[in-house]
């Protein structure tokens, strides 16, 4: 399986909020015998290996962060302590897995990854990440809501999470 | 702080089963973001990942060792043991249990290890 | 399985000297891979994480690097204190070991 960043780049106004995506795909097995764990942490781009460095999120850390579930399964982080610091991790169906942060301040810019571990039971791991940036603008030229830039040269997108 | 400890026969006899038990403290077993495993290092040798166990049950084994190995897991007990059958002179090591952290992947936890002689 | 090859086996240098050790995975592994300090008589202890991170409480003159493939790690100013044997351990998939190298000093 790998993962992909539906967009590189998002740029945001100061106090929006924003939900940075990454997408699981490929021959992924749904069955009773598979684990996904799927955390969040912020990094720097390195000169060989972008998100080798693991940072925390808002004083949380990857730990904090993570998710797991079959590979049936969707989930999320309901837990008080990550939504006391305004963020929420979550996975769906489809193999999208997020993380919301609200109220966005400067101080959350920077490179985001995701990090997913799938445990096949009797058999294998294997593990992938994805990486993206966030920026947070203030002032007159700071965009009026988010804006996501594919990480294909398709054209921009508006988007701000609930 | 997690501690781990290995206890079991110094001595086995070729053919026999080596049974070794790793009990956990400083921490739960059950917890959903580890694996507890097993690695053994010959005399003067390196080191070899035999195997390791998820904390619902589900195991991995190394593919060379995979028909000879079982561990299992007593959470009640917050312990996991090493079951190695029809073993010879080249199962003689140094047995270790550790903890691996799914999400970060090395073994960062380790039990001081325990040597195991097979001999008549 | 993935096979992980370490050079050199063994290595004889004076305190002060910068030690190098490498390390190849037989196929991509990104960055999973680890480096261990083992004393004689103890277990092993984790030093070095993705390849370049720094375990919490590692000296700094520790260090690592490298992708897929090909991995390097250094020590930059040897101590006696660092005399040991060195193992690398990828974690791309199923755990493998490199065959160790043993430190020296001279």
């Known amino acids: 399986f790998k993962v992909a960043t539906l967009y590189s780049l998002y740029v945001c106004p100061e106090g929006q909020n924003v939900t940075l995506t990454c997408r699981v795909f490929g021959p992924v097995d749904k069955g009773h015998d598979v684990t996904f764990y799927k955390t969040w942490y912020r990094s720097s781009r390195g000169e060989v290996q972008t998100c080798s460095e693991r940072r925390p999120i808002r004083n949380l850390t990857f730990q904090d962060l993570h998710l797991h579930h079959g590979g049936h399964q969707a989930a999320n982080t309901s837990h008080d302590l990550a939504q006391r610091h305004g963020l929420e991790s979550a996975s769906d169906h489809h193999g999208n897995f997020s993380i919301t942060m609200r109220n966005l301040t400067l101080l959350d810019s920077g490179l985001y990854c995701c990090l997913v571990v799938e445990i096949r039971h009797h058999h294998s791991e294997h593990r992938v990440h994805g990486a993206m940036e966030l920026q947070v603008q203030t002032g007159k030229d700071a965009p009026s809501s988010c804006v996501a830039y594919p990480s294909s040269s398709q054209e921009s997108e508006n988007i701000t999470a609930a | 702080q997690l501690q781990l400890q290995e206890s079991g026969p110094g001595l086995v006899k070729p053919s026999e089963t080596l049974s070794l038990t790793c009990i956990v403290s400083?921490?739960?077993?059950?917890?959903?973001?580890?694996?507890w495993g097993w690695i053994r290092q010959p005399p003067g040798k390196g080191l070899e990942w035999i195997g390791s166990?998820?904390?619902?049950?589900?195991?991995h084994y190394n593919p060379s060792l995979k028909s000879r190995v079982t561990i299992p897991v007593d959470t009640s007990k917050n312990q996991f043991s090493l079951k190695l059958s029809s073993v010879t002179a080249a199962d003689s090591a140094v047995y270790y249990c550790?903890?691996?952290?799914?999400?970060?992947?090395?073994?960062?936890?380790w039990g001081q290890g325990t040597l195991v002689t097979v001999s008549s | 399985d993935i096979q992980m090859t370490q050079s050199p086996s063994s290595l004889s240098a004076s305190v002060g000297d910068r030690v190098t050790i490498t390390c190849q995975a037989s196929?991509?592994?990104?960055?999973?891979l680890t480096w261990y300090q083992q004393k004689p008589g103890n277990a092993p202890k984790l030093l070095i994480y993705?390849?370049?991170n720094l375990e919490t409480g590692v000296p700094s003159r520790f260090s690592g690097s490298g992708s897929g493939t090909d991995f390097t790690f250094t020590i930059n100013s040897l101590q006696p204190e660092d005399v040991a044997t060195y193992f690398c351990?990828?974690?791309?998939?199923?755990?493998?070991f490199g065959g160790g190298t043993k430190v020296e000093i001279k």
């Open positions: 550790a903890r691996r952290d799914i999400l970060t992947g090395p073994f960062d936890y």
């Open positions: 400083g921490g739960s077993i059950s917890s959903s973001g580890y694996y």
């Open positions: 166990i998820f904390y619902s049950g589900n195991t």
């Open positions: 196929q991509d592994i990104t960055n999973y």
């Open positions: 993705d390849a370049s």
């Open positions: 351990q990828q974690y791309d998939n199923l755990p493998t």
